[in-house]
Interface confidence: low
């Protein structure tokens, strides 16, 4: 006869491990007892359990409550046992020794491998701002046994770097994602993907990118200078910009205070019926926590009584 077992038994942390040991005997052969021991290199054998055909299962004190026989029905030639709630310290070499009649003793070894699934964590880097060079966007760390794989899933262009730390029974892997921040990255997902043989499916943690920026400011409303004439109603100037965080707007007049009756409504400057008093240089100030921009325009209100139109100058400044 011969013993049937596995070279390696793999189990996830906390699960039950079946340690197989089956005697494939000739007709009429019987198994008297099966002894299980842990036999790691450099250490003496540590008894787990003795499975006796007559007296049943005897478990050594160190494994009390953790070693059982598989549920019925049982084959009298099957010396397999269950190791309950596997922990990392259970990883190692095990031996089953089978005493048979009349063929004598047989022994076989297997290795128990305990997979420790990782619990990944994602840490965003410093605040991203347009104009920075290569900057850390996020780092992702996962520790497990064996070492997990950490990769990134994103449409954003960037570079990754990984480092590993080996622990006594596990390894931690940290991967960093670096990028050159630009406004187009705002709202883009950056996903850390952790793979491990102890996971049924990859674990994914998503971080949404936020890049601070402020676009150049410009003023609309003076495209047709002939519309800016005395008496015109509904004239307005609109300041155009965009930013992250969203910017705030402020209007001033360079050559004096804003004329009475002029309304400031966020990015819009609304005029009452135009008079020559409304002529002047108007400045839109745009700002957010990242930066500020200015754009100024010169308004000349035309008098229809005069023949010649006047020039309208537009100037932008940052």
């Amino acid at each position: 006869g011969e013993l049937e077992t596995s070279d390696v038994v793999t189990v996830v942390l906390g699960q039950d491990a079946k340690l197989p040991c089956f005697y494939r005997g000739d007709s009429g052969e019987q198994v008297g007892q099966v002894a299980w021991a842990r036999v790691d290199a450099g250490e003496g054998a540590q008894e787990l359990a003795l499975l006796h055909s007559k007296y049943g299962l005897h478990v050594s004190p160190a494994y009390e409550g953790r070693v059982e026989q598989p549920p019925p029905p049982r084959n009298p030639l099957d010396g397999s046992v269950l190791l309950r709630n596997a922990v990392q310290a259970d990883e190692g070499e095990y031996e089953c020794r089978v005493s048979t009649f009349p063929a004598g003793s047989f022994q076989a070894r297997l290795r128990l491998r305990v997979l420790v699934p990782p619990l990944p964590s994602l840490n965003p880097g410093p605040a991203l701002e347009e104009g920075q060079g290569l900057t850390l966007a996020a780092s992702c760390t996962a520790e497990g046994s064996p070492a997990p794989s950490v990769t990134w899933d994103t449409e954003v262009k960037g570079t990754t770097s990984s480092r590993s730390f080996k622990h006594s029974r596990s390894a931690a892997v940290t991967s960093e994602f670096h990028l050159v921040p630009s406004r187009s990255m705002n709202g883009q997902p950056l996903t850390c993907v952790v793979s491990h043989p102890g996971l049924l499916q990859d674990q994914r943690i998503t971080h949404i990118l936020h890049v601070s920026f402020l676009a150049e400011a410009s003023v609309r409303g003076l495209e047709d200078q002939n519309l800016w004439h005395i008496g015109r109603e509904g004239a307005m100037l609109k300041c155009l910009s965009e930013g992250q965080p969203p910017p705030s707007y402020n209007w001033t007049r360079l050559d004096g205070p804003l004329p009475s009756g002029v309304r400031v409504d966020g990015d819009t400057l609304g005029f009452p019926p135009l008079t020559t008093e409304h002529s002047g240089i108007y400045v839109c100030h745009v700002s957010n926590e990242f930066s500020s921009r200015d754009s100024q325009v010169t308004v000349d209100v035309l008098d229809p009584q005069e023949d010649s139109g006047k020039q309208v100058d537009l100037v932008s400044a940052s």
């Epitope: 310290a89 730390f165 622990h167 006594s168």
Partner: antibody, heavy 117, light 106 residues
Framework: QVQLKESGPGLVQPSETLSLTCTVS????????VHWIRQSPGKGLEWLGV???????DYNAAFVSRVTISRDNSKSQVFFKLNSVQADDTAVYYC???????????WGQGTTVTVSS | DIQMTQSPASLSASVGDTVTITCRAS??????LAWYQQKQGKSPQLLVY???NLADGVPSRFSGSGSGTQYTLKINSLQSEDFGTYYC????????FGGGTKVEIK
């Protein structure tokens, strides 16, 4: 502040067991690993083993058959035993603290152990 | 086990000098390296961990660098209190220490 202090006999007979105690203060041994390291002129610094915050142990493969590390949480003490000592086990024995990894941010002052009849 | 080879075994330097100590691992240790300072009759003190990170309270004249198998501890503007023996130690698996570098007064 963080302190570790080793105590035990300074002289041990050959073939007997060396027993040392590390008493700590300023931190909890249930939050940090406590390691044993020895230093001798012939062999330099040698890491012997550790008891981790959760109570599990790891030993240097060269000493695994001779070393046992245990602890008493209530007394903030870690115990070190080295069986079957010989003259070349004569050394200064240190206990040291670590976080998750095997580098040592605080050390005891060390205790000199001589193995001699 | 991974072997750590430290050089030089000893050196003489003066206050104000720059001192460089190197440590070579027998295989890649992925920056899992620490440096310690030990003075006569005292226990070792952590200077640098993870190859480049200064431990709390360590003066900025100390710096660590390196990757793979080659690592360096640099002391800028050596002070009188810096004399002693320096050890490297890897923590990629079972830790081992280098043989030490004794820094003496010239």
């Amino acid at each position: 502040q963080v302190q570790l202090k080793e105590s035990g006999p300074g002289l041990v007979q050959p073939s007997e067991t060396l027993s040392l105690t590390c008493t700590v203060s300023g931190f909890s041994i249930t939050n940090y690993g406590v390691h044993w390291i020895r230093q001798s002129p012939g062999k330099g610094l040698e890491w012997l083993g550790v008891i981790w915050s959760g109570g599990s142990t790891d030993y240097n493969a060269a000493f695994v058959s001779r070393v046992t590390i245990s602890r008493d949480n209530s007394k903030s003490q870690v115990f070190f035993k080295l069986n079957s000592v010989q003259a070349d086990d004569t050394a200064v024995y240190y206990c040291a603290r670590s976080g998750k990894w095997y580098y040592f941010d605080y050390w005891g002052q060390g205790t000199t152990v001589t193995v001699s009849s | 086990d991974i072997q750590m080879t430290q050089s030089p075994a000893s050196l003489s330097a003066s206050v104000g000098d720059t001192v460089t100590i190197t440590c070579r691992a027998s295989q890649n240790i992925y920056s899992n390296l620490a440096w310690y300072q030990q003075k006569q009759g005292k226990s070792p003190q952590l200077l640098v961990y993870a190859a480049t990170n200064l431990a709390d309270g360590v003066p900025s004249r100390f710096s660590g660098s390196g990757s793979g198998t080659q690592y360096t501890l640099k002391i800028n503007s050596l002070q009188s209190e810096d004399f002693g023996t320096y050890y490297c130690q890897h923590f990629w698996g079972t830790p081992t220490f280098g043989g030490g570098t004794k820094v003496e007064i010239k």
